[in-house]
């Protein structure tokens, strides 16, 4: 059914400051991926820290810090002529607007590192 | 400061489904990081596809593919004894819950790629 | 029905490792992490680490000394507590418990019914 | 790690009593507070959480309240299947803690 041709796109200047969100989560069958273990086999490895705030929603999420400042060789060891880097993405949690009733929330914005990838240095030639 | 003792939890039966969410976003300085080159000069390259739906708040998300099954090597070359994957991470976005109007949504949980790491394969050793 | 089911009671020697097992059932496993909490004979409750099934991310108590290995198994739901160089002090109930990702206001509502671990020469 | 101090570690009383519990913070950077139940060779189970909030299917008598680094459990009026032994938890500072436990019991 086609929208209202009066009703304005969420990204425009007139769309509404409050709107109603339903928490009974929408789940796009997003769990049939299996864990991944890739944090341990990556060239560029790293570990899991745990940030939790309770008037966040969602309260607890896991973000990476890589593990060297170089990658990981085929024997194993960190070659620093390359680079272990983060890979960033930026999210929408809800965050509690007042601590008395857990009713009323506002969307921020958030930058977590999801995981590193080994990149290639920028190599800055001097003059 | 305390919340409310006559505050029922969001996961609570009696918490109410829908809660009021305002879309003043904090934390807008998120996008003052530059866009990174590293899906260029990773190891695990990979392209950023647009996925834009207009009934989904962000209505635009880009997302990764790996370029490559395996990584680049130090000559450039494909090297198929490592494997580049998609680094997966679940991200909520605000669904609308109706066509008609854009005041109503629902949070939907989704699984997006947002970048490529090397790593070493599984051997499976037959018996 | 959320339900944790963990694993049958183990008699250890001192020195040697114990895993125990926790099965979830009734929920999406990988929406919350799951904590285990220890219980020696007459005391109190002692929490020993978090793992989350969905990164494998995971945080200990340090006071377990890098002893204590958390792990989980998405394609089964369940979660395991490694346990390694046991001593007699390390003898108690082992649980394990849910804590909701999304909202952890909601922290350790269900628990499983305990495993209890006797480490004697 | 902050150490979660309750009192009275035991305590006897009768059917009908109001009894309160509390625990204390070896400092005050503590978020919240949640409350537990234990009976004999079961499980935990959750009373309060976040300080304040019954957890679902815990009857209106039991009530958490405090600030800071005390905090109290009330149970207004004391049924036959509230003795049990009861536990504080401290979050927001890791590891996160249980205070020592109040053995509540039959006068």
């Known amino acids: 059914m086609p929208r209202n041709p009066g009703c304005p796109n969420a990204e425009d200047k007139n769309f509404p400051q409050n709107v109603k969100v339903s928490l009974n989560i929408l789940n796009k069958s997003v769990n049939s991926r299996r864990p991944s273990d890739y944090y341990n086999r990556s060239t560029s490895p790293w570990t899991l820290h745990r940030n939790e705030d309770r008037e966040r929603y969602p309260s607890v999420i896991w973000e990476a810090k890589c593990r060297h400042l170089g990658c990981v060789n085929a024997e194993g060891n960190v070659d620093h002529h390359m680079n272990s880097v983060p890979i960033q993405q930026e999210i929408l949690v809800l965050r509690r607007e007042s601590q008395h009733c857990p009713h009323s929330f506002r969307l921020e914005k958030m930058l977590v590192a999801v995981g590193c990838t080994c990149v290639t240095p920028i190599i800055h030639h001097m003059a | 400061m305390p919340r409310n003792p006559g505050c029922p939890n969001a996961e609570d039966k009696n918490f109410p489904q829908n809660v009021k969410v305002s879309l003043n976003i904090l934390n807008k300085s998120v996008n003052s990081r530059r866009p990174s080159d590293y899906y260029n000069r990773s190891t695990s390259p990979w392209t950023l596809h647009r996925n834009e739906d207009r009934e989904r708040y962000p209505s635009v998300i880009w997302e990764a593919k790996c370029r490559h099954l395996g990584c680049v090597n130090a000559e450039g070359n494909v090297d198929h004894h490592m494997n580049s994957v998609p680094i997966q991470q679940e991200i909520l976005v605000l669904r609308r819950e109706s066509q008609h109007c854009p005041h109503s949504f629902r949070l939907e949980k989704m699984l997006v790629a947002v970048g490529c790491t090397c790593v070493t394969p599984i051997i499976h050793h037959m018996a | 029905e959320v339900q944790l089911v963990q694993s049958g009671a183990e008699v250890k020697k001192p020195g040697s490792s114990v895993k125990v097992s926790c099965k979830a059932s009734?929920?999406?496993?990988?929406?919350?992490?799951i904590h285990w909490v220890r219980q020696a004979p007459g005391q109190g409750l002692e929490w020993m680490g978090v793992?989350?099934?969905?990164?494998?991310?995971?945080f200990y108590n340090q006071k377990f000394d890098g002893r204590v290995t958390l792990t989980a198994d998405e394609s089964t739901s369940t979660a395991y507590m490694e346990l390694s160089s046991l001593r007699s002090e390390d003898t108690a109930v082992y649980y394990c418990t849910r804590y909701s990702k999304w909202d952890s206001f909601d922290g350790m509502d269900y628990w499983g019914q305990g495993t209890t671990v006797t480490v004697s020469s | 790690d902050i150490q979660m101090t309750q009192s009275p570690s035991s305590l006897s009383a009768s059917v009908g009593d109001r009894v309160t519990i509390t625990c204390r913070a070896s400092s005050g950077i503590i978020s919240y507070i949640d409350w537990f139940q234990q009976k004999p060779g079961k499980a935990p189970k959750r009373l309060i959480y976040a300080t304040f909030d019954l957890a679902s299917g815990v009857p209106s008598r039991f009530s958490g309240s405090g600030s800071g680094t005390d905090y109290t459990l009330t149970i207004s009026s004391l049924q036959p299947e509230d003795f049990a032994t009861y536990y504080c938890r401290q979050v927001g500072s890791y590891p996160e803690t249980f205070g020592q436990g109040t053995k509540l019991e039959i006068k």
């Open positions: 009734g929920y999406t496993f990988t929406d919350y992490e």
């Open positions: 793992n989350d099934p969905e990164s494998g991310g995971t």
